[in-house]
Structures are given as C-alpha cells and as structure tokens.
C-alpha cells in the first residue's frame, strides 16, 4: 500500500502522469462524477492531498484498452491548459523512481 | 490591471504574532493556486507557503511549519498568512505570487510586498 | 529538497554586452526552470518558464536554454534597464527553490 501522505507535486507531477498515461495523454481535471459533485483536479489531489497510481490513472485521456466504459466524453480542458515542455527530454528514470514512491 | 496588494507588515516582537492580506484583482482569484513568498534584507528569494485555489489545502515550507497558516477568501479575493511564535529568522518582505499552476508552476503575478520586522 | 546554484553571483558588464548567467540543480528538474528578474525594493518579475518560454511582454533579448541540472539565461544585448538581480527557481517538487542570485551591475 502506498503511504497516504505521499505527494507529487510541479513538474514531478506532470512527468509521472506522462509515464503513467503514456500515448494516452493526461487532463489537470476531470468531468464530476456521480460520486464526486466537484472535480477537484489533479493538482490538488495529488499535490495538497494524497496520490497513489490508480488516482493518476484516472487523469489518462483515453481510457486503457483493459477497461471495458469507453463512453466517457473527453475532458474539456481549461483556458490556462499547461505550457509544460510535454514530451520533452523523456527521463526515464525518474518518472520509475516517482511510481515506484507511490507504490510503497 | 492583473494586481496583488500586500498589507498588515510591520514590527512585532519574537514570539509575537502578525496577519498580512493579499487583495487581488484583474484576474479570477478563485481558480489559482496562491502563494506567499519572503525575501530576507539582502538575501534571496524564499518559498513560504501555498494554497490551492479552493482553500481546502495548503502546504508550507519547513521553516515555517506549524507557526504560519494560510488560507484565502474567495468571495473578497483575498489572501492571507497568520503568522505565529515569530522568530527573528522571520524578519522579510513578503510577497504574495499567483501561481500559474498549469504553466509550470512559475509566479507570474507579484505584489508589492510587505516588510515585516521581528525585533525585541 | 532540490538545491538551486548560481554563477557567477555578481557580474559587471556594459550596454550592448552579451550577459549569460548559469543555474545548477541539485538533481534533475526536466525543463522546469523559471528565471526572474528583480530590481532594488521592487517584486520579482517572471522572464521565462519552462527553461525557454519567454514571458509575455519580456523583450527578445532574454533567452533560457537548458535541461535536467544546466541552465543559462542569456541576455543577447545588454539594456539600461536590465541591470538587477536575476533568479532562477525550480518547480519540480515542492519546496519550490530558488537560486541565490546573480546581480547584473554596470562596468
């Protein structure tokens, strides 16, 4: 079980995601749910609350092939949606190191 | 005018307490993460704390854990820090700084600061 | 923490020079590097992000390369109005660090 005080945070943040949702691409937030009114977005779930690997799955664009509800319609993402160098300078080794923090 | 005002700096003795507020405008307050940031006489630049932009959660740096607090008021577009059990360590000018959350995480946005003192 | 090196930390240069400034990190940060610009009893001001996105309104002359642990701001003809103190800052991880400074004065 991951430790619930594990964080990530700024670019960690962005660059775990990435690993996590490879080809797949990642939203900051996600349409509400039935069980949750607001969405809170992942800046402040994974970096003021509590992260683990299924939370940041949950921020892939496209569901994964194992998952059977593909009718969720595509976030709209917001106007101020990231300037970060996405898919710059892959890093390997550290987006491993940033999992496998989340999966003790 | 994007625009961040500082106030409530001043002298204060150590184990003394202090609020400063942050009054925003030109912009929507309510979806960005804010920030305190301090700068000590002659030094340079240091992270206090953040807020995310619904209130609910903060995070702070070491230093300062425990003894400052912020929080926002998003009905005034306002900001704060309570600042506790000062310490001589603590005196700076602080800055309030928007957050731009989705671009980096950069601090585009800056009042003027406020100097805040602690002297016996 | 992620620990943030500057050089040279002062530096006199004249109008028209070509100024570079490098930023070290502790460990590797991507391309997330921002560098400010402060001028005495004045807030810091954002110039680039992302270690090359120029701020807008931040005139050409400023430019930021760099990657994992070495950057560099350059200033490609030195203005009046470009001497301060120049940070950079990594948001990597929390906490979010600054360099110590480089101070950009006239020759």
């Known amino acids: 079980a991951y430790r619930p005080s594990e964080t990530l945070c700024g670019g960690e943040l962005v660059d775990t995601l990435q690993f996590v949702c490879g080809d797949r691409g990642f939203y900051f937030s996600r349409p509400a749910s039935r069980v949750s009114r607001r969405s809170r977005g992942i800046v402040e779930e994974c970096c003021f609350r509590s992260c683990d690997l299924a939370l940041l799955e949950t921020y892939c664009a496209t569901p994964a092939k194992s998952e059977r509800d593909v009718s969720t319609p595509p976030t709209v993402l917001p106007d101020n949606f990231p300037r970060y160098p996405v898919g710059k300078f892959f890093q390997y080794d550290t987006w491993k190191q940033s999992t496998q923090r989340l999966r003790r | 005018e994007v625009q961040l005002l500082e106030s409530g700096g001043g002298l204060v003795q150590p184990g003394g307490s202090l609020r400063l507020s942050c009054a925003a405008s030109?912009?929507?307050?309510?979806?960005?993460?804010m920030a305190w940031v301090r700068q000590a006489p002659g030094k340079g630049l240091e992270w206090v704390s953040s807020?995310?932009?619904?209130?609910?959660?903060?995070k702070y740096a070491d230093s300062v854990k425990g003894r400052f607090t912020i929080s926002r008021d998003n009905s005034k577009n306002t900001l704060y820090l309570q600042m506790n059990s000062l310490r001589a360590e603590d005196t700076a000018v602080y800055y309030c700084?928007?957050?731009?959350?989705?671009?980096?995480?950069?601090?585009?946005?800056w009042g003027q600061g406020t100097m805040v003192t602690v002297s016996s | 923490d992620i620990q943030m090196t500057q050089s040279p930390s002062s530096l006199s240069a004249s109008v028209g020079d070509r100024v570079t400034i490098t930023c070290r990190a502790s460990?590797?940060?991507?391309?997330?590097l921002n560098w400010y610009q402060q001028k005495p009893g004045k807030a810091p001001k954002v110039l680039i992000h992302a270690a090359s996105t120029l701020e807008s309104g931040v005139p050409s002359r400023f430019s930021g390369s760099g990657s994992a642990t070495e950057f560099t701001l350059t200033i490609s003809s030195l203005q009046p109005e470009d001497f301060a103190t120049f940070y950079c800052q990594q948001s990597y991880s929390v906490p979010f660090t600054f360099g110590p400074g480089t101070r950009l004065s006239s020759k």
């Open positions: 030109g912009f929507t307050f309510s979806e960005y993460v």
């Open positions: 460990q590797s940060i991507n391309t997330y």
């Open positions: 700084a928007k957050d731009m959350t989705y671009s980096g995480d950069a601090f585009d946005v």
């Open positions: 807020i995310v932009s619904s209130g609910g959660y903060t």
